[in-house]
């Protein structure tokens, strides 16, 4: 049994990590293989996570952690029984994958503009809760060429935009997603959609 | 919010032991290691050690070393300092503080006399 | 002792800057990060700065803070009386046994 590609882990920056590696053939991850995480500081104990199957030799692992912070180190050894198939380590802060925003509503009730909210999906006392900028994705579900992303530079979770902008009549669907830009992380996964109908007064012309 | 309630002031004779408790709350209480410190009148703050309140295992400066025991009570979220052989010279307030690589919170801190 | 130094005492008056350095060596600052406190008269300390130039939520951005090699640096804009207090750096030495050196402290005047 050998790993044929070695695990690559990514941090929600709060509470998981989640490795994902490739074996040489089909594997049943989690009776086979354990993979092992400790953080490199004083008194800290070992942990052990039980891999899930992803895909016939592929595996991944969801490593719980508490209270992570930028100086964070972990060393990772993943074994099969008494047989050490690969040791490395991971910085949970050089590979941060932020938490989807959550909650996403869309406000339809202010006269001919769209409140779009949603939630900030970090704490107040996690670092990248004031350090989140967002891009929202709306499109139609009748027009596949009627698709735009808003980015939103500012903290505030909303983004107000003139239901002009999009036709009148038909369906559309948003979604957010996040990204920090002090630790240089990939986009979030996209939060769940949300479906409103655009309607609103067209102008008056003479 | 994150509360760090500790004991109340003690005064204590030469030779004697002191255990100055540090009640933690809103947060969970074995995912954050808890420092203490002291700082004696009109001087700088000094590192004594540290606990892991998960395993219960603990780190202490060198310069406390067979002085200092710390300990922890998971049920009542609680955790322990306990400095023997006390001498004038640890007259000083006494402070917990939760974080690992620095300190996110400190507790108001407990002032021991030690007197003859 | 500690092997954090800080100068004893700075002073300006409000609206001003300030700095406050902390030297140390290789083994603390120069492999750690840092972290600032400031404790206000008979108070306990609180956290001002850490992971070197990181603030927690609250502490207003007039507070920033360096780091080069052995040294890191704590810089207060726009200073107001309320800013009067002791201030320290700390950081970590996992050279030999782990242990939290803290600066030796500087008193912060506001003229």
């Known amino acids: 049994m050998k790993v044929l590609q070695e695990p690559t882990c990514v941090s929600d920056y709060m509470s998981i990590s989640t490795c994902e590696w490739k074996m040489n053939g089909p594997t049943n991850c989690s009776t086979e293989l354990r993979l092992l995480y400790q953080l490199v500081f004083l008194l800290s104990e070992a942990h052990t996570c039980i891999p899930e199957n992803n895909g016939g030799a592929g595996c991944v692992c969801h490593l719980l952690m508490d209270d992570v912070v930028s100086a964070d180190n972990y060393t990772l050894d993943l074994w099969a029984g008494q047989q050490l198939l690969w040791k490395g380590s991971f910085k949970p802060s050089e590979h941060v994958k932020p938490r989807a925003p959550g909650n996403l509503t869309v406000h339809t009730n202010v006269s001919d503009t769209l409140l779009l909210t949603w939630s900030n999906p970090y704490p107040p006392d996690n670092y990248l809760y004031n350090h989140l900028t967002y891009a929202v994705n709306i499109w139609s579900e009748n027009d596949p060429a009627d698709f735009r992303i808003y980015n939103v530079t500012y903290l505030e979770p909303s983004l107000r935009i003139a239901a002009s902008t999009l036709k009148s009549g038909i369906s559309y669907r948003a979604r957010v997603r996040a990204w920090a830009q002090c630790y240089n992380t990939t986009w979030s996964e996209w939060s769940p959609s949300t479906k409103w109908h655009n309607s609103y007064r067209e102008p008056f012309e003479q | 919010q994150v509360q760090l309630v500790q004991s109340g002031a003690e005064v204590k004779k030469p030779g004697a032991s002191v255990k100055v408790s540090c009640k933690a709350s809103?947060?969970?209480?074995?995912?954050?290691?808890m420092h203490w410190a002291r700082q004696a009148p009109g001087q700088g703050l000094e590192w004594m050690g540290i606990?892991?309140?998960?395993?219960?295992?603990?780190s202490y400066a060198q310069k406390f070393q067979g002085r200092v025991t710390m300990t922890r009570d998971t049920s009542t979220s609680t955790v322990y300092m306990e400095l023997s052989s006390l001498r004038s010279e640890d007259t000083a307030v006494y402070y917990c503080?939760?974080?690992?690589?620095?300190?996110?919170?400190w507790g108001k801190g407990t002032l021991v006399t030690v007197s003859s | 002792q500690s092997v954090l130094t800080q100068p004893p005492s700075v002073s300006a008056a409000p609206g001003q800057k300030v700095t406050i350095s902390c030297s140390g060596g290789?083994?603390?600052?120069?492999?750690?990060?840092v972290s600032w406190y400031q404790q206000l008269p008979g108070t306990a300390p609180k956290l001002l700065i850490y992971?070197?130039?990181k603030r927690p939520s609250g502490i207003p951005d007039r507070f920033s803070g360096s780091k080069s090699g052995t040294s890191a640096t704590l810089a207060i804009t726009g200073l107001q009386t309320g800013d009067e207090a002791d201030y320290y750096c700390?950081?970590?030495?996992?050279?030999?046994?782990?242990?939290?050196?803290f600066g030796t402290g500087t008193k912060l005047t506001v003229l």
């Open positions: 809103g947060y969970a209480f074995t995912s954050y290691y």
């Open positions: 290789s083994s603390n600052i120069g492999n750690s990060y």
């Open positions: 606990i892991n309140p998960s395993g219960g295992s603990a």
């Open positions: 503080a939760r974080g690992k690589y620095w300190m996110y919170d």
């Open positions: 992971d070197n130039n």
């Open positions: 700390g950081t970590w030495d996992s050279s030999t046994v782990w242990e939290w050196p």
